[in-house]
């Protein structure tokens, strides 16, 4: 906090310019008009102030706008954005994507800070949904952004926005999130032909149900093992050996290396050993020949 002192004669700032770096903190406080500062915030971003000087400028803006900064000021905050608390940011009403981009640029290369998380939350809530342009912007700055959202938040993503999603954006998503995103992706890509469709939908398949996997197995997609290992266990279990063979194509040989890991391990336990043997991979653990398999879940449903 800088003491309130009168501005020395001749030092009253008429504009925000480089001469202000020669002002001491108390002089900045006394000689820079907050309203002038607010209208010329863009100039602050071209002047090499010290962090202490910037603290004084922030203090002046806080006094001028106790209810929160207007967007005209927010857009030009630059480094000062990093000095804001989440409480400060919750007072803002940010509607312009250009403002969002300008502030994300300041934090570029760093982890998502509490300030950035709060800013994004305010922005998305203000828009009512995660539209394509917003999602494009956010995933460009933070590839993991999508997977940081709860399933409830993801439900506000319109299918049209899914086109902006890259495979790496989904790397850290868990099954609950993919359960929400997969139907949106299916809808978004529904008019594409077989091979193109598979390329686009592949990253989302961790949310796919059994019937969709069965359908894909009829389309010669040659799913790689990495994708297969991310499928929902409950969606893989009902697949037959023939269906898995068709789904994986030449990658089926990779099952051997994964036979102790889910979902392959659990799937093997559900298959007849005879059927597994037809793959010629030496997979063990299937149901021995002559055993009868009762599906108790089906029996319960019927009763």
């Amino acid at each position: 906090e800088v003491e309130k002192t009168a501005c020395p004669s001749g030092k009253k700032a008429r504009e925000i310019d480089e001469s202000l770096i020669f002002y001491k903190k108390w002089e900045l406080e006394a000689c820079v008009d907050a309203a002038l500062l607010a209208t010329q915030m863009d100039r602050v971003n071209a002047i090499p102030f010290t962090y202490e000087q910037l603290d004084v400028l922030k203090h002046k803006l806080d006094e001028l706008y106790p209810q929160g900064y207007p967007e005209s000021v927010i857009q030009h905050l630059g480094y000062l954005f990093l000095k804001m608390s989440p409480e400060d940011i919750r007072k803002w009403n940010v509607t312009s994507l250009e403002t969002l981009k300008a502030l994300l640029e300041v934090n570029k290369g760093h982890e998502m800070s509490p300030q950035v998380a709060t800013l994004i939350d305010r922005f998305v809530k203000g828009r009512g949904q995660l539209d394509k342009d917003t999602l494009d912007t956010l995933t460009a700055f933070y590839p993991g952004y999508l997977c940081s959202l709860s399933p409830e938040e993801l439900s506000s993503v319109p299918p049209s926005s899914i086109w902006a999603v890259r495979p790496q954006d989904l790397d850290t998503c868990d099954p609950r999130q993919l359960d929400v995103l997969y139907p949106k992706a299916r809808l978004a890509f529904q008019n594409m032909n077989g091979s193109e469709y598979f390329v686009k939908i592949q990253s989302f398949l961790g949310g796919a149900p059994t019937e969709d996997l069965k359908a894909l197995s009829q389309q010669n997609v040659s799913m790689d093992l990495a994708t297969f290992m991310k499928l929902r266990t409950d969606a893989v279990l009902p697949l037959t050996v023939a269906e898995v063979q068709k789904l994986l194509g030449p990658h089926v040989e990779g099952l051997k290396a994964e036979e102790r890991h889910r979902p392959v391990r659990d799937w093997i336990l559900r298959q007849r050993q005879d059927d597994l043997d037809t793959l010629g991979l030496g997979l063990q653990g299937g149901i021995p020949n002559g055993y009868l398999v009762l599906d108790l879940s089906m029996q319960e449903a019927l009763s």
């Epitope: 602050v44 071209a46 002047i47 102030f49 962090y51 954005f81 640029e105 300041v106």
Partner: nanobody
Framework: LQLVESGGGLVQPGGSLRLSCAAS????????IGWFRQAPGKEREGVSS????????NYADSVKGRFTVSRDNAKHTVYLQMNSLKPEDTAVYYC??????????MGQGTSVTVS
């Protein structure tokens, strides 16, 4: 973002020193740079500034005519040439920079003693 100052040392009154400011982990080329100094027990004060192109320079009254700020973008370095040094120039000298989107950087300082 970190800036690194060098070139400080002990010099006699009337002597000269050249301080350098370089960037660590990024390039200084599109950064406007300010030189500041802080004497023991005093507030940090601005000494000089230079625009990102080098076309515009400014000086505090106390160093005008004695100090010259320049930059060599090929070497990604900004310099502060200090001539006719006085005992009152004794301080830790810092550089601070501002780049695109208001990104900021500041150094840890280099000590200058005129005695």
């Amino acid at each position: 973002l970190q800036l690194v100052e060098s070139g400080g040392g002990l010099v006699q009154p009337g002597g000269s020193l050249r301080l350098s400011c370089a960037a660590s982990g990024f390039t200084l080329d599109n950064y406007a740079i300010g030189w500041f100094r802080q004497a023991p027990g005093k507030e940090r004060e601005g000494v000089s500034s230079i625009s990102s192109s080098g076309g515009s320079t400014n000086y505090a009254d106390s160093v005008k005519g004695r100090f010259t700020v320049s930059r060599d973008n090929a070497k990604h370095t900004v310099y502060l040439q200090m001539n006719s040094l006085k005992p009152e120039d004794t301080a830790v000298y810092y550089c601070a920079g501002v780049g695109a989107y208001g990104r900021r950087a500041m150094g840890q300082g280099t000590s200058v003693t005129v005695s």
